[in-house]
Each structure stands twice: as structure tokens, then as C-alpha cells.
């Protein structure tokens, strides 16, 4: 008769590192003590006639255990296969590109270390909770990849990797491990450069707005803008409106920046850069400055008028050009009464990058001369009727401007000048009209002939 040696449990499944109670039994009546053959750590717990119980501890890997016993002149054996399940020690999604261009493929790569049995282990790649790929874990470590076409919707989306150890057929459930999520950043950066609006010329110590615009940018809020005049970074205000980015700054030129310069606008997104450059000439345009040798000249004195401006500036003083650009223009005159209040005009012209810039300046000359009463404006003989209204039209000139008073000879009676007054017979007589200033006096005799009115 053939006797059997039973091993229980048959083909058990247990968690890695766990323990297992094994019972070996036979119905052989003359059996010896049962031995357990395994590489696992074992301990005999109890035994009796035809049976032995063992405890296996720290079961770390799949193993075949064998029980052997001597029975009726032969050795009989029984076996059981232990399947160990182990959750993956590491489930990690490889770092994603820092920025991914929309419309281009990128690879999701998940690494799974450990985890068994491999035949029950599946690796799932996810976007949010959407499955992108489901593959069996094969090698050790297992590496699972999926190619994804980046879209705008993927910006900020979490990608993760999940392992599923399916021990449901063994009645143990589905064990899930999920990696830490990684966020993808996608972007669109058009091939076209930004539009840069900047002045062609910029005068030293003056300010001018500079605008830089780029359309079709995503996400516009993540873009970085660099605006500079030469090597001087400009403080830009950046505005986003949809997929359009606008940076505005004020460019102020310094004296040390004079000459040909560039305004640069860099827009950086996703590690890529678009650049626009515009040429700009920084110029210095001093003047024109018009000078009088004597701002207030005495009649008969010589006055020099000069006009000067910065280097490369052509000046013209009262139509007379300077000998060369950068040189002053001058004229001399003998100051006369007619020059009082005369304005001298200077125009300056600077050529900047093929364009001509014009500036004007003027100065007024004051000539000091003595008082005069213009006989043409002051009639020396007046015939007026009694009891009528009249104006003594007399005008004096001079610099400083003279005071004009008309006094009746032999009395202190004064008639107003330039103001209407009521005439009567008492106004009849000779008047001394005197213009006086710090420069002297000028007297003109005016006779007033007052006709008495007819008596009715």
C-alpha cells in the first residue's frame, strides 16, 4: 500500500516577511519522525504519531517546502509551494521636463522596485485619474513608459504612476501603491519675435515710453520679460491679456550712453527665448544759448551777440551761420535807440542718424537812452473850444521809460496827458511838457488856445 504525506496549507500566499504554520501528516502506521526541508527559517512546534507542525518565519521569497518521512522501508515526501507577495518598495515617476512645448511628445517613465509576484503586478500611468497606459511589470526594477502629446490642458496637470498587485484570485484583494504626483508645465512660444515700439532717437536726460508685445503666448502669466537700453535694464510693467503679453517701460538716457544703442526686449518662457532689437541713437542737444555781452547797453556802446550750442550743432544767428558745426555764431552792433527791445534769434540744427533736429532761442536787447517826446505825437498848438472834452495826446519815449508831465507856465497847473479831461477857458496858455528819467529831461512847449463859447 502507498501512503501519502500531506503538507498543509497547500500552495499558500503570504506577505513578505510573514510567518507560516505548516503541518505535515501521514497515515503511515510505522512512520518515523517527519522532517521539513526548506531553506527558510523553521522551528519544530509540535509533533506526534504521523504528524509534525512547524513554524516558518521571515518568509521573504517564493519557496518550495518539502516534508519527508521514513515509511515501511522507503521515504515518502510531500510538498507545498509558498507564494510570497510583496508590495513594491519604490514606485516613482521620473521627473518631467521643466517645460514641455504644446504639440510635442514627451515620455512618462515609471520605475518600480521590488513587488511580487511579478505576474500579478501591473503598472498604470495616469493623468489626473485618467489611465494613459497599463502594462505588466517585467524586469527588476521594472520600467514602464508612455508617450504623451502635450496639450494646453496638460498645463498644471498631475501625472502619477500606480502599481496594482492583484491578489484577488488568491482571495487577498488588490494592493495599490501610487507614486508622488508630478506636475507638468506646458507652453506655447510663437516663433515670431516680439513687437518692440521704441523711439529712434532719445535725448540725454529725457524719457520716452517703450512697449514690447508678444501674441500667442501660453501661459502668458509665466513668461519673463527683459527690457533694456544697452546694458541698462528697464523697469518694466508687464500686463497679460489672454495670450498677449505687453511690457511697458520708460527709457531714460544717460550722458554716458550717447551714441548708437539698442533697445532689447527678451521674452522667455519654457526655457526658450524670443528677442526683438531696435536701434536707437542717444544724443545730446545742448542749446542754442544766445548771449549778449551787455544785456542792457548804453546808447552808442558796442554790443556783441553770440550763439553757441553743443558739439556737431550748426547754429545760425539772425540768418548768419556759424563757420562750422560746433562753432559759435557772433555779431556786433553799435547800440542805438532803435535797437532797444530788439530780439536776436538763433536757430540750431543737429543731424542725428540722417534726420535734422531744430531748436530756436532768442534774446532781447535793452538800450538805455534819454527821454524824448515825439513831436509827431505831440501837437505843439492846440485849438479847442471851451466846455468840451479833449485828450492831450503826447507820447514820450526813452529807456528807462520817462515820466511825462505838462505844466502851465507861471503856475503849477497840470493837465493830464493821454486822459480825457474837461476843457475850459482857464486852460488857455502855454504849457511846458517835460519827459524826465534818470537819463535826463526833454521839454516841449505846447500852446493851448481855448475859444470862449458863444453867449446866447
Amino acid at each position: 500500500q502507498e501512503f501519502l504525506l500531506r503538507v498543509e496549507p497547500q500552495n499558500p500566499v503570504l506577505s513578505a516577511g510573514g510567518s507560516l504554520f505548516v503541518n505535515c501528516s501521514t497515515d503511515c502506521p510505522s512512520s518515523e519522525k517527519i522532517a521539513l526541508e526548506t531553506s527558510l527559517s523553521k522551528e519544530l512546534v509540535a509533533s506526534g504519531m504521523g504528524w509534525a507542525a512547524f513554524n516558518l518565519s521571515n518568509v521573504t521569497g517564493n519557496s518550495r517546502i518539502l516534508c519527508s518521512v521514513y515509511c515501511n522501508g522507503s521515504q515518502i515526501t510531500g510538498s507545498s509551494n509558498i507564494t510570497v507577495y510583496r508590495l513594491p518598495e519604490r514606485v516613482e515617476l521620473a521627473p518631467l521636463p521643466p517645460w514641455q512645448p504644446v504639440g510635442q511628445n514627451f515620455t512618462l517613465r515609471c520605475q518600480v522596485e521590488d513587488g511580487s509576484p511579478r505576474t500579478s503586478l501591473t503598472v498604470v500611468l495616469l493623468r489626473w485619474e485618467e489611465e494613459l497606459s497599463r502594462q505588466p511589470a517585467v524586469e527588476e526594477p521594472a520600467e514602464v513608459t508612455a508617450t504623451v502629446l502635450a496639450s494646453r490642458d496638460d498645463h498644471g496637470a498631475p501625472f502619477s504612476c500606480r502599481t496594482e498587485l492583484d491578489m484577488q484570485p488568491q482571495g487577498l484583494g488588490l494592493f495599490v501603491n501610487t507614486s508622488a504626483p508630478r506636475q507638468l508645465r506646458t507652453f506655447v512660444l510663437p516663433v515670431t519675435p516680439p513687437r518692440l515700439v521704441a523711439p529712434r532717437f532719445l535725448e540725454v536726460e529725457t524719457s520716452w515710453p517703450v512697449d514690447c508685445t508678444l501674441d500667442g503666448l501660453f501661459p502668458a502669466s509665466e513668461a519673463q520679460v527683459y527690457l533694456a537700453l544697452g546694458d541698462q535694464m528697464l523697469n518694466a510693467t508687464v500686463m497679460n491679456h489672454g495670450d498677449t503679453l505687453t511690457a511697458t517701460a520708460t527709457a531714460t538716457a544717460r550722458a554716458d550712453q550717447e551714441g548708437a544703442r539698442e533697445i532689447v526686449c527678451n521674452v522667455t518662457l519654457g526655457g526658450e527665448r524670443r528677442e526683438a532689437r531696435e536701434n536707437l541713437t542717444v544724443f545730446s542737444f545742448l542749446g542754442p544759448i544766445v548771449n549778449l555781452s551787455e544785456p542792457t547797453a548804453h546808447e552808442g556802446s558796442t554790443v556783441t551777440v553770440s550763439c553757441m550750442a553743443g558739439a556737431r550743432v550748426q547754429v545760425t544767428l539772425d540768418g548768419v551761420p556759424a563757420a562750422a558745426p560746433g562753432q559759435p555764431a557772433q555779431l556786433q552792433l553799435n547800440a542805438t535807440e532803435s535797437d532797444d527791445g530788439r530780439s536776436f534769434f538763433c536757430s540750431a540744427t543737429l543731424e542725428v542718424d540722417g534726420e535734422f533736429l531744430h531748436r530756436n532761442s532768442s534774446v532781447q536787447l535793452r538800450v538805455l537812452y534819454g527821454p524824448k517826446i515825439d513831436r509827431a505825437t505831440c501837437p505843439q498848438h492846440l485849438k479847442w473850444k471851451d466846455k468840451t472834452r479833449h485828450v492831450l495826446q503826447c507820447q514820450a519815449r526813452g529807456n528807462p521809460y520817462p515820466e511825462l508831465r505838462c505844466l502851465k507856465e507861471g503856475s503849477s497847473r497840470e493837465v493830464p496827458v493821454g486822459i480825457p479831461f474837461f476843457v475850459n477857458v482857464t486852460h488857455n496858455g502855454t504849457y511846458q511838457c517835460q519827459a524826465s528819467s534818470s537819463r535826463g529831461k526833454y521839454t516841449l512847449v505846447v500852446v493851448m488856445d481855448i475859444e470862449a463859447g458863444s453867449s446866447h
Partner: antibody, heavy 118, light 107 residues
Framework: QVQLQQSGAELAKPGASVKMSCKAS????????MHWVKQRPGQGLEWIGY????????EYNQKFKDKATLTADKSSSTAFMQLSSLTSEDSAVYYC???????????WGQGTLVTVSA | DIVMTQSPATLSVTPGDRVSLSCRAS??????LHWYQQKSHESPRLLIR???QSISGIPSRFSGSGSGSDFTLSINNVEPEDVGVYYC?????????FGAGTKLELK
């Protein structure tokens, strides 16, 4: 009757290896477990390990894991033990002992004397 | 490893005596305890297995008792040929371990 015939004495140099044999007769070789025991001159007994010739399974005393290798040849009903990297500490009499279970030795060989000397 | 402690180390007897040899295990080994006799210049010989089971061909004056961790080998009516070293062996846990032995000598 059960008999275990062990090979003759061995003289070996330090660092060398020796392989001794134990031929079984009087029973079916694959039905018994074969144990190996060490005894140094004037000392007690030390279990080295066993082999089950039926399954070729070996169980070692951890102390001898890197020293002894147990094998069995079913066709010649002979068990072997190889000792490697010999030192003077390995000078001893080595016994084979068979039994109907894995837990003791019922039938003992006459022993093989191993002397390790430069 | 289970440590087996035998006492006494040496036992001087007179033929005809009844003697008891003691063996203690460092932990419970149930009845997995075996006794061996080794005469001078001879191989060991199994006397008792599993604490009390007698072995075919071994004189009936040899008997064993005990369970757990305390065991005894008794020899009734000691004979001069019983001189030698007696070893107990743990068979419960691997590695199998032997006691240091009790030397039986004649007075």
C-alpha cells in the same frame, strides 16, 4: 545489517581541501538521512549537517556552512563531505551516521582522521 | 542554538551499581533527546532515542526518561564494559547539539 564504511585517514596542508567518503550498505541508500559529526582529539561531538540522498536536501550547522560541502551519489550509495580552506582547527575525526529521520544518528561509520599540518 | 548541559562530568561507579546521568536543555525540546555511548577509540553508539525509546541490540539495563528540558539516562546493574563517555543530543532544533559528555569510570 547496516554498515557505513568511511575512507582512510587524510594528511593535508593548511589551505588545502579534502574530500572523504562514506559508503552505505545493508539498507536502501535513499531512504535514510546521512549526518556528519566532528570530534577533535579528546573533545566532544559537533554536528556538521545532514544530507537527504532522496531529495539532495542539505541542512548545515551555520558554523560549518562555509567549511563543509555535503553530497551524495545514489548510484554508488555513497555520501561525501568536502572540507575546504583547511586549518589546524580542522584536524579531527569525522564520522558519518545514518538514520531513518533527520534528528539523530543511528548507525555510525568508523570515522576518518584528518590531520592538517604544514 | 540550544545548549545541552550534562552532569556530572565524571561518574565513578562499582559494577552492579544503578546510576543516573542527567542532561538539561536550555529550552524545551519535547522528547527530541537522544543518548549515545562512546567507548575509547570507538565510534559513538545510539543507546536511546526520543528520550525513552529503546534501540534494538542495546542491553535492557539502559533506559531513558524525561521530557521538555530535563532528561535522565539510567543504567541498572552497571557492568565493566559500560565504561566510556555518554553524550545526550538535542534533536528538536537545528543545529543538532550535543552535551559535553559524562565520563563513566570504574572505582
Amino acid at each position: 545489517q547496516v554498515q557505513l564504511q568511511q575512507s582512510g585517514a587524510e594528511l593535508a596542508k593548511p589551505g588545502a581541501s579534502v574530500k572523504m567518503s562514506c559508503k552505505a550498505s545493508g539498507y536502501t541508500f535513499t531512504t535514510y538521512w546521512m549526518h556528519w559529526v566532528k570530534q577533535r582529539p579528546g573533545q566532544g561531538l559537533e554536528w556538521i549537517g545532514y544530507i537527504n540522498p532522496n531529495t539532495d536536501y542539505t541542512e548545515y550547522n551555520q558554523k560549518f556552512k562555509d567549511k563543509a560541502t555535503l553530497t551524495a551519489d545514489k548510484s554508488s550509495s555513497t555520501a561525501f563531505m568536502q572540507l575546504s580552506s583547511l586549518t589546524s582547527e580542522d584536524s579531527a575525526v569525522y564520522y558519518c551516521a545514518s538514520s531513518r529521520d533527520a534528528y539523530h544518528g543511528t548507525y555510525w561509520g568508523q570515522g576518518t582522521l584528518v590531520t592538517v599540518s604544514a | 542554538d540550544i545548549v545541552m548541559t550534562q552532569s556530572p562530568a565524571t561518574l565513578s561507579v562499582t559494577p552492579g551499581d544503578r546510576v543516573s546521568l542527567s542532561c538539561r536543555a536550555s529550552q524545551s525540546i519535547s522528547d527530541y533527546l537522544h543518548w549515545y555511548q562512546q567507548k575509547s577509540h570507538e565510534s559513538p553508539r545510539l543507546l536511546i532515542r526520543y528520550a525513552s525509546q529503546s534501540i534494538s541490540g542495546i542491553p535492557s539495563r539502559f533506559s531513558g526518561s524525561g521530557s521538555g528540558s530535563d532528561f535522565t539516562l539510567s543504567i541498572n546493574n552497571v557492568e565493566p564494559e559500560d565504561v566510556g563517555v555518554y553524550y545526550c543530543q538535542n534533536g528538536h532544533n537545528f543545529p543538532l547539539t550535543f552535551g559535553a559528555g559524562t565520563k563513566l569510570e570504574l572505582k
